[in-house]
């Protein structure tokens, strides 16, 4: 009972975790405008992996995409090959844990497959979650580094006659969400892996026997060994092939070059 | 057709107060920040506040801080600037605007005037 | 606080004739994150409300003459009417509509020979 509690759980914390990581990936606040110590404008810039936008006071909001695949810079590359393989690997997780729940019955499946596809998923949950948090700090940290950068020439003007406001970017909402939801991924998938120990056949050598001894009403049960020869031990390996994943910008009818924060 | 009718101006004395409206037709009131200007006799415009959609955040200039506040109900399409603490420099025609792109006032009205004498 | 300055304070024109008036801020008004400059133009006729004209420095409002055109970036703008007509005799004014108070420029006023 509390092996299958434990998978279910993980497999919820999992799903929660991985739809958080696609929530973080699509949104638009991963940098936005540092409004402390700067110049009150009527205009609020924020930026995601995939397009920047500025928000007026008047209401009106105005994004445009990222065209340039080789323009844009290395760090932001990574971080969007890293969210997606996170996204990849933790849906693919998804579609396996499905299979080794013990709720669910698919056929004579055996509990030593159960256990095996049980680690499968916890592992890639755990490689997702990573994936997630590695991605949100590589950003993070380039947000730092620009944020510090922009601080030591904040204004940079003309004989001090005319000043330029530099904008400076600090962390937005997604970056919480991609380091909530890459630990709750990870947590599930530490989760799947625990209840994969307990999902892994037990077999023992010795049945019980009770022994009777004259004048003695104690019984003594000999075995209790655990025969295990490790997980998944005698199942067959699966290859799990992805796809490849592929991500287009939305077109836009007004290309520009965009200074990424 | 986008309409803007101001009311509520007239005579002030200094110190006394009052209450200007603006009310709104032929456009979505709700979805649109709106400011309000003012333009003393024989002089040039000036910007006095400007108020959100949602009323989240409201802008004065330095000289009516404190003394002026905007206000906005939305189901009723008006706009309103309560003026305290009044003076004499603050005669002048106020006129409502619309933010439209580039937080530009796109449409305004025909203007009240306030005057502020003893 | 952004200080717009316009030049000339008047212009004395005839008809047809080319106008450039200029507007300078303090600041600049160039927004990267979009690539565009938070300024506007307005003309205020005598008795009346002023009526925008130009919003993003050069895109005209629909309903307004081709004959205004905007342009400059950064801190340094012009109004370019090409061929004045009466009916543009006006005084016009720019406007900071990046930092707040989203202040005005004296403004400029076209008067005629």
């Known amino acids: 009972m509390a092996v299958t509690a434990c998978q279910g759980l993980g497999f919820v914390v999992s799903l929660i975790g991985i739809a958080g990581i696609i929530a973080a990936t699509c949104m638009d606040q991963w940098s936005t405008q540092d409004l402390y110590n700067n110049p009150v404008t009527a205009v609020f810039n924020y930026q995601g992996l995939w397009r920047s936008c500025v928000r007026e006071s008047s209401g009106f909001t105005e994004c445009r995409g990222y065209f340039t695949l080789l323009g844009l810079p290395a760090m932001l590359q990574a971080v969007r090959a890293l969210m997606i393989v996170g996204i990849v690997l933790g849906a693919i997780g998804l579609l396996v844990s499905i299979f080794a729940l013990k709720c669910i019955r698919i056929g004579s499946m055996e509990d030593s497959a159960k256990a095996n596809m049980t680690l499968t998923s916890g592992i890639m949950f755990i490689v997702s979650g990573l994936c997630a948090i590695a991605g949100v700090s590589v950003f993070a940290n380039m947000l730092v580094t620009n944020f510090w950068m922009s601080t030591a020439n904040m204004y940079t003007g003309m004989g001090g006659m005319v000043q330029t406001v530099q904008t400076r970017y600090t962390f937005g909402a997604a970056l919480f969400v991609g380091w909530v939801a890459g630990g709750l991924t990870l947590i599930g998938g530490v989760m799947m892996c625990i209840a994969c120990r307990g999902l892994a056949p037990e077999e023992t050598n010795y049945k019980a026997v009770s022994y009777h001894a004259s004048g003695h009403s104690v019984a003594y049960k000999p075995g209790g060994f655990k025969a295990s020869t490790g997980f998944g031990s005698n199942t067959k390996n699966k290859k799990i092939y992805d796809g490849g994943a592929r991500t287009e910008d939305e077109v836009q009818s007004y290309p520009s070059k965009h200074d990424y924060v | 057709d986008v309409q803007l009718v101001e009311s509520g101006g007239g005579l002030v004395q200094p110190g006394g107060s009052r209450r200007l409206s603006c009310a709104a037709s032929?456009?979505?009131?709700?979805?649109?920040?709106m400011y309000w200007v003012r333009q003393a006799p024989e002089k040039g415009l000036e910007w006095v506040a400007f108020?959100?959609?949602?009323?989240?955040?409201?802008y004065y200039v330095d000289t009516v801080k404190g003394r002026f506040t905007v206000s906005r109900d939305n189901p009723k399409n008006t706009l309103f600037l309560q003026m305290t603490s009044l003076r004499s420099e603050d005669t002048a025609m106020y006129y409502c605007?619309?933010?439209?792109?580039?937080?530009?006032?796109?449409?305004w009205g025909q203007g009240t005037s306030v005057t502020v004498s003893s | 606080d952004i200080v717009m300055t316009q030049s000339p304070s008047s212009l004395t024109v005839t008809a047809r004739e080319k106008v450039i008036m200029n507007c300078k801020s303090s600041?600049?008004?160039?927004?990267?994150?979009?690539?565009?400059?938070?300024l506007s133009w307005y003309q205020q006729k005598p008795g009346q409300p002023p009526k925008l004209l130009i919003y993003?420095?050069?895109t005209r409002k629909s309903g307004v003459p081709d004959r205004f055109t905007g342009s400059g970036s950064g801190t340094g703008f012009t109004l370019t009417i090409s061929s004045v007509q009466a009916e543009d005799l006006a005084v016009y004014y720019c406007?900071?509509?990046?930092?707040?108070?989203?202040?005005f420029g004296a403004g400029t006023k076209l008067e005629l020979n």
């Open positions: 993003w420095a050069s």
């Open positions: 605007g619309r933010t439209g792109y580039g937080n530009a006032m796109d449409y």
């Open positions: 108020i959100t959609s949602d009323s989240t955040s409201i």
């Open positions: 032929g456009f979505s009131f709700s979805n649109f920040g």
């Open positions: 600041q600049s008004l160039f927004n990267s994150g979009n690539q565009k400059n938070y």
């Open positions: 406007q900071n509509n990046y930092f707040y108070p989203l202040t």
